[in-house]
């Protein structure tokens, strides 16, 4: 059997699971006691063609319903569970509330309001983030839809949107609640060095501390075998013997074009003149290959204030 | 020519350890990455982890992190890999592979082009 | 990760039969795709990379092509050695994945 459910005191309405023709008739009882469930619309539980409609719905309404549709060869038999639950009292909507995720990943994006269709429904559907309404002009409510535009990480949550039922004149309150998820389509690149500049000289003081960062991209998503490091005369410099010439572990950055992006900084203690006549390579690499930008150091000019 | 020559079959109880190595020859193998790729019974192929043997960077897959270990000894031109925690659904053909691309000239195409002969791996206890 | 899915998931085939082996990927991956053929018992071997170039060695009956999300593998007719599990692997995004292999059975 399919299962179905509703809020208390909001209006639900499911449909038959068994689909026949249109025009073959449908009936509805109450599993348990086999007892018909009415057409007529002064009841607050009748039958409108193959839909139930609890209008509003109670949490006793909460059972095992069957349709018949009678077609003239055979008669097919469909089970619904129906579960009416309380209102949350918190925002946190429990998951048997939840309609199915939305996994999105464009730029603009959006998201449908789950079972609307069945409903006599008027525009405009208000929409909400964990229970937040959405106010932002990124946001924007188009008939049963959601449009979300520039669609980031932060935009991942629960979204709920709320609209009216109208029936023989009154207006009935329906709320609905599905996930968003983005999925950041992802690429690897051969490594893009953005610091140092390639074949750059930098000028440092004797005996002063000097740092000089090495920053690299490789793409967008999360990066395998990826890495910055730098080399003293081609060696590592965990191997160059030199405890003032320290490396500090590659952090995780996003450039401004949202690149994923690594940066090693080595740091110098106490410039010497010895550290003058050494290479430093910038490296990065990753599965696509290595690229080094080498680099220089030069004492600084002194400024001349005659 | 090219050669990746791995370690023997082995039998291992649930909770220990295996480390199986992937022996090289045939090209220079600091130029190279190498990754671990493993298959069970009637599965498909699942990526493990990999490392760049000239700067020792290894990397896992999430599905592997902290469980595997992947090693290269450059005077040997042998890379390593373990996997600790064993469980029965890790019993598979565990294969290294080496990746197409150069480090030294960034030529290449991103593939992997030579592989071991696979080094089966029984969890039984 | 980058989903691949491959159809079909077996396929039976004579000698001298056109084979062909389609991949999809969940999100466009330009041509960085491979194919891979595996045998009972043996470890993978490389046959197409970038999506259409021939790997050295391997027979110029297998041919690749397609690019964004849809490729294909042919085999323009099949030999009694080429009767193996055959992989499709993406290289756009680590970590590179593979889809789920087509066996190409005798009939």
């Known amino acids: 059997s399919k299962s179905s459910w509703g809020l208390e005191n909001e209006a639900l309405i499911v449909r038959c699971p068994q689909r026949g023709r249109s025009t073959y008739p449908v009936e509805w009882y109450y599993s348990d006691t086999n007892e018909s469930i009415p057409t007529q619309k002064r009841n607050r539980i009748f039958v409108s063609r193959d839909r139930l409609k609890f209008l509003p719905a109670r949490v006793e309404d909460s059972g095992i319903y069957a349709c018949v549709i009678r077609s003239p060869n055979l008669n097919k038999t469909g089970y619904l569970n129906v579960t009416i639950h309380k209102k949350p009292p918190s925002c946190n909507i429990p998951d048997y509330l939840m309609y199915s995720t939305v996994r999105g990943s464009d730029k603009n994006f959006k998201i449908t309001c789950p079972t609307i269709d069945l409903y006599n429904w008027t525009a405009p559907v208000q929409w909400f983030k964990n229970c937040k309404a959405l106010q932002e002009p990124r946001f924007r409510a188009h008939r049963s839809y959601l449009f979300i535009d520039n669609v980031t990480h932060d935009d991942e949550g629960d979204y709920t949107c709320q609209f009216t039922h109208a029936e023989n004149g009154t207006n009935y309150i329906v709320t609905a609640t599905r996930s968003f998820t983005v999925e950041e389509k992802g690429f690897s690149m051969f490594p893009v060095i953005t610091n140092p500049p390639y074949n750059h000289t930098m000028e440092v003081e004797i005996g002063k501390p000097a740092s000089i960062a090495c920053s690299a991209c490789f793409g967008k998503g999360s990066h395998f075998l990826a890495d910055v490091l730098w080399q003293i005369n081609k060696t590592v410099v965990g191997n160059f013997g030199e405890a003032r010439i320290q490396e500090e572990e590659g952090r995780n950055e996003s450039s401004s074009n949202d690149m994923d992006c690594l940066t090693s900084v080595l740091r110098i203690t106490g410039v010497t003149e010895k550290d003058l006549s050494l290479e430093y390579d910038c490296l990065a690499l990753n599965l696509h290959g290595m690229i080094r930008h080498t680099i220089r150091l030069r004492r600084k000019q002194p400024i001349d204030h005659r | 020519q090219v050669q990746l020559v791995q370690s023997g079959a082995e039998v291992k109880k649930p909770g220990s350890s295996v480390k199986v190595s992937c022996k090289a020859s045939?090209?220079?193998?600091?130029?190279?990455?190498i990754i671990w790729v493993r298959q069970a019974p009637g599965q498909g192929l699942e990526w493990m982890g990999g490392?760049?043997?000239?700067?020792?960077?290894?990397d896992y897959t999430q599905t592997f992190q902290g469980r595997v270990t992947i090693t290269a000894d450059e005077s040997t031109s042998t890379a390593y890999m373990e996997l600790s925690s064993l469980r029965s659904e890790d019993t598979a053909v565990y294969y290294c592979?080496?990746?197409?691309?150069?480090?030294?000239?960034?030529?290449?195409?991103?593939?992997?082009?030579?592989w071991g002969q696979g080094t089966l791996v029984t969890v039984s206890s | 990760d980058i989903q691949m899915t491959q159809s079909p998931s077996s396929l039976s085939a004579s000698v001298g039969d056109r084979v062909t082996i389609t991949c999809r990927a969940s999100q466009s991956i330009s041509s960085y795709l491979n194919w891979y053929q595996q045998k009972p018992g043996k470890a993978p071997k490389l046959l197409i990379y970038?999506?259409?170039s021939l790997q050295s060695g391997v027979p110029s009956r297998f041919s690749g092509s397609g690019s964004g999300t849809d490729f294909t593998l042919t085999i323009s007719s099949l030999q009694p050695e080429d009767f193996a599990t055959y992989y499709c692997?993406?290289?756009?995004?680590?970590?590179?994945?593979f889809g789920q292999g087509t066996k190409v059975e005798i009939k």
């Open positions: 490392i760049i043997p000239v700067f020792g960077t290894a």
């Open positions: 592979a080496r990746v197409s691309t150069n480090y030294y000239d960034s030529s290449g195409y991103y593939a992997f082009d030579y």
């Open positions: 045939g090209y220079t193998f600091t130029n190279y990455a």
């Open positions: 970038d999506a259409s």
């Open positions: 692997q993406q290289t756009y995004h680590t970590p590179w994945t």
